[in-house]
Amino acid sequence: AITEAREEAKPYPLFPGPFPGSLQTDHTPLLSLPHASGYQPALMFSPTQPGRPHTGNVAIPQVTSVESKPLPPLAFKHTVGHIILSEHKGVKFNCSISVPNIYQDTTISWWKDGKELLGAHHAITQFYPDDEVTAIIASFSITSVQRSDNGSYICKMKINNEEIVSDPIYIEVQGLPHFTKQPESMNVTRNTAFNLTCQAVGPPEPVNIFWVQNSSRVNEQPEKSPSVLTVPGLTEMAVFSCEAHNDKGLTVSKGVQINIKAIPSPPTEVSIRNSTAHSILISWVPGFDGYSPFRNCSIQVKEADPLSNGSVMIFNTSALPHLYQIKQLQALANYSIGVSCMNEIGWSAVSPWILASTTEGAPSVAPLNVTVFLNESSDNVDIRWMKPPTKQQDGELVGYRISHVWQSAGISKELLEEVGQNGSRARISVQVHNATCTVRIAAVTRGGVGPFSDPVKIFIPAHGWVDYAPSSTPAPGNADPVLII
């Protein structure tokens, strides 16, 4: 296409020195269209009489000759007004003007649709000097026209601060229809009407549209572009395209697939990412979405224990990120897990069920009847308790954790003992005398540490006291017993 710019072209000098070759007195007539040898473009000349100056933009020079005769008005000569040609063909057109020799530095520039054109390889200016005037022919050529070359071309000449403008030359590039809007692929609901749009332009106009569905024409009579096809509804996938016809021939749009929305396929590859005592993290690969985006997914969980009541827990989640943590499960239990996802049409079938297990849980109950008493002879605190009633799912008891906090006027410290599961008593060394010792005990399984028992406090006197009664877990409602005798 043509380079467009708004800056001034470099002026051609009016007398550029000796012309290449000899000056011809019988030079080409001013309104001929010089062509490359052998090239005959299709031209449509305007009906204006050749050779006569037009009455458009005319400059009346104020300068007079030696004989004081006023100079004639300056104007571009009429040339062809409208050129029609096919895409990719070449074209050459020109402007011509005779300029009195008294003018120097005349500039001719080409303009298209109001913008100056630059590109010396397109424009050539030739000078034919005579005694009083110089004939100037400005030619413009395009080797392979495109649709973007369509438009109105003019020549402009600046002379004596006046601007002379030629009549426009309209270039019309014709070709096969060109699509400005093609039908788009769509996903539609079964038996629901939808529209497809097709628009194409020339020149030449008019452009007529035929619609094609699965290789068969839909409309017997063409419609003028633009055309909207209303499809009353489909029951199965179809491919649509449109044909655009003009006098130059036919262009076919891309074929677009119209899909029928359906329920999704079930998810696949449900897998266990992580398991804890009370939760299972699962992931899945979504199935085919049925040409409609997934909205959400449902995780179905049922106890795999044959003795369970068979009830199904349902957890709803968003479709992304194909990951869900199932919570509030029993410890050390087996579950069957399936995933189903939905789109606007409905729910998929459930994925293949997978088996998953939770791990051992921490004990849910603290040791009972905690009793603490001071054994002065050995300077120890003896602690006794009852094993908590553990549920099967809490896992196997592996031991106990004993927290003992020592508080006196000068110190406060907490120590932690971990003891094995055998027996239900422990002995800890007295850390501080004249202090309060607060004891808490928790049961431990491989699943974790259970809750601590309620605190039991005992006062450890200074050395020399005689009798010590035990402290024990308070009865409900009595907090912080301190039994000192």
């Epitope: 508080q407 406060s412 907490e414 607060t438 605190p455």
Partner: antibody, heavy 118, light 108 residues
């Protein structure tokens, strides 16, 4: 008086790890345990883990695979490290002393605001 | 894990008004391990009531706490301006230790 001072980065890249140091004064870590808790607009306050006075650690099962708490009693410092952070780990992270009486989190650090973003 | 549900999530009271907020546990919690924290905007939580009913150091006597099993409450006998804050209940009994979602108390 009892003080817990936290230091750590404000911005962490996704999949990277977070390290926060809690430096304590006014008490000894050999006598007291130290908890870590975080607070986010979406999930509220969440307990993450504890290091007891003797160095035993307990972690929230939801974080056990990517959490580590260690301490240096002589320097009065507890080091918290969480791996593989994602956007939903954006929160304010707190250290808090485990009291004796009250047997609760009785003193808290000032918090470290952590944003996980690339 | 034990879920603590606080209600109401947001409440407003006139100065001098009596205010009660509740905390319900999904499983039984020993009263020795149920605590309340108060948090002012931009600050860390602060221990406010421990072992269900004991006031932490420096807490005004107009605050009180009660409850057992799965139902606990915090009461302010006469609302004052400085009491506007968010209050969280916390169970330190069953691991993982959990917090309620908070009750935001505002002045009417």
């Amino acid at each position: 008086q009892v003080q817990l001072r936290q230091s750590g980065p404000g911005l962490v890249q996704p999949s990277q790890s977070l390290s926060i140091t809690c430096t304590v004064s006014g008490f000894s870590l050999s006598n007291y345990g130290l908890h870590w808790v975080r607070q986010s607009p979406g999930k509220g306050l969440e307990w993450l883990g504890v290091i007891w006075s003797g160095g035993i650690t307990d972690y929230n099962a939801a974080f056990i695979s990517r959490l580590s708490i260690i301490k240096d009693n002589s320097r009065s410092q507890v080091f918290f490290k969480m791996n593989s952070l994602q956007a939903d780990d954006t929160a304010i992270y707190y250290c808090a002393r485990k009291g004796h009486d009250p047997y609760a989190m009785d003193f808290w650090g000032q918090g470290t605001s952590v944003t996980v973003s690339s | 894990q034990i879920v603590l549900t606080q209600s109401p999530p947001i409440m407003s009271a006139f100065l001098g008004e009596r205010v009660t907020m509740t905390c319900t546990a999904s499983s039984s919690v020993s009263s020795s391990y149920l605590h309340w924290y108060r948090q002012m905007p931009g600050s860390s939580p602060k221990l406010w009531i421990y072992d269900t009913s004991n006031l932490a150091s420096g807490v005004p006597a107009r605050f009180s706490g009660s409850g057992s099993g799965t139902s606990y409450s915090l009461t302010i006998s006469s609302m004052e301006a400085e009491d506007a804050a968010t209050y969280y209940c916390h169970q330190y009994h069953h691991s993982p230790y959990t917090f309620g979602g908070g009750t935001k108390l505002e002045i009417k």
